[in-house]
């Protein structure tokens, strides 16, 4: 019957994700019992995405690799609301890699998922970015300006934030 085949589909989808994420936390989307959205446990969710704060200190390249192994990317921040959600889970005395880099040192910033870089939706600290040698972006806290972005050397180990699309089952 219909409910049985839906359950089978769900189970096979869950098996797909099990290699990365042994446990998912799912919530019912809206009123329809058939639509569930899930994030890996203990990732947090906001709108249509899941977020994970990685506290291991790694270079930007290794951080991105670490996210991709989990089926995610370093975080791409698209709105002020999204950044406001993310910072609730960050520590003020730490810095976290974003999925934003300037690979050629030409001030041509680009997001890991090819989202177009829009100067009008950026949250750089004042006077940042400011160095051709600093090709990767972090988010950190400055007492004068609260949370914002800064450019730093990509090889200097930092914590990081991973982001993935919610899993719909």
């Amino acid at each position: 019957n219909f409910m049985y085949s839906k359950t089978v589909k769900r189970l096979s989808k869950l098996r797909e994700y099990q290699q990365y994420h042994p446990s998912l936390t799912c919530v019912m989307e809206g009123k329809d019992i058939e639509d569930w959205s899930c994030c890996p446990t203990p990732w947090t969710s906001f709108q249509s995405s899941c977020y994970f704060i990685s506290t291991g200190m790694q270079s930007w390249t290794k951080s991105q690799k670490n996210c991709s192994v989990m089926g995610a990317d370093l975080v791409v921040i698209n709105t002020r609301e999204e950044q406001d959600f993310i910072i609730q889970n960050l520590k003020r005395n730490s810095s976290y890699f974003l999925g934003l880099s300037d690979p050629g040192g030409r001030r041509h910033w680009q997001w890991v998922d090819q989202t177009p870089y829009n100067e009008n939706v950026t949250f750089w600290h004042s006077g940042e970015p400011n160095n051709l040698d600093e090709r990767c972006a972090i988010i950190n806290f400055r007492s004068s300006e609260e949370w914002g972005w800064n450019d730093i050397h990509c090889h200097v180990p930092q914590k990081s934030i991973c982001k993935m699309k919610k899993i719909y089952i």
Partner: antibody
């Protein structure tokens, strides 16, 4: 203290090439890109380009593409700039300068005079 | 490319004078404006970066100001050792470009 020591003056014939060097000391060489700037006799300063001492990639001023090649030897903390197919217009003092925060060249070498003459 | 213009190519002043050198960019450079001093022997030193920040070791008689396209360097109490040519440079956009220079002489 930060020092950039450039190689000595060169006199070269038209059509030839010349390679000038810039040795950095007093800081971590690979943390700072190296810029090259030229000054023709009685003229102002002109930015030639910049090379990353960490990655080894370069950004050139379009005007100098094909004329200039920048390289780096990390083991000796030295940046090089080779000028090819020299003409009298290339007679100038060439400076290396360290990259700094706020898109600036914070320390400069003493300059290398290249004279192109037959 | 962004054009940088220093309208005054040479300037004569007396010791102790307050001297201002100006620089104009062909478009907004977001305060990424730096000032360099070139001594007669060819030595080049950074004085001011990001419009108004004093580089380490530079005497406090040097100051910078400006925004958008118009910037200036001020030497508040002219000293004999300030005899030099002063260049502005924009770092907002590659290729970086310099003004033509202002040569400062003593009256």
């Amino acid at each position: 203290q930060v020092q950039l020591q450039q190689s000595g003056a060169e006199v070269v014939k038209p059509g030839a090439s010349v390679k000038i060097s810039c040795k950095g000391s007093g800081y971590t060489f690979t943390d700072y890109s190296m810029h090259w700037v030229r000054q023709a006799p009685g003229q102002g300063l002109e930015w030639i380009g910049v090379i990353s001492t960490y990655y080894g990639d370069s950004n050139y001023n379009q005007k100098f593409k094909g004329k200039v090649t920048m390289t780096v030897d990390k083991s000796s903390s030295t940046a090089y700039m080779e000028l090819s197919r020299l003409t009298s217009d290339d007679t100038a003092v060439y400076y290396c300068a360290r990259n700094g925060n706020f898109y600036v060249m914070d320390y400069w070498g003493q300059g290398t005079l290249v004279t192109v003459s037959s | 490319d962004i054009q940088m213009t220093q309208t005054t190519s040479s300037l004569s002043a007396s010791l102790g004078d307050r001297v201002t050198i100006s620089c104009r960019a062909s478009q907004d450079i977001s305060n990424y404006l730096n000032w360099y001093q070139q001594k007669p022997d060819g030595t080049v030193k950074l004085l001011i970066y990001y419009t108004s920040r004093l580089h380490s070791g530079v005497p406090s008689r040097f100051s910078g100001s400006g925004s958008g396209t118009d910037y200036s360097l001020t030497i508040s109490n002219l000293d004999q050792e300030d005899i030099a040519t002063y260049f502005c440079q924009q770092g907002n956009t590659l290729p970086w470009t310099f003004g033509g220079g202002t040569k400062l002489e003593i009256k």
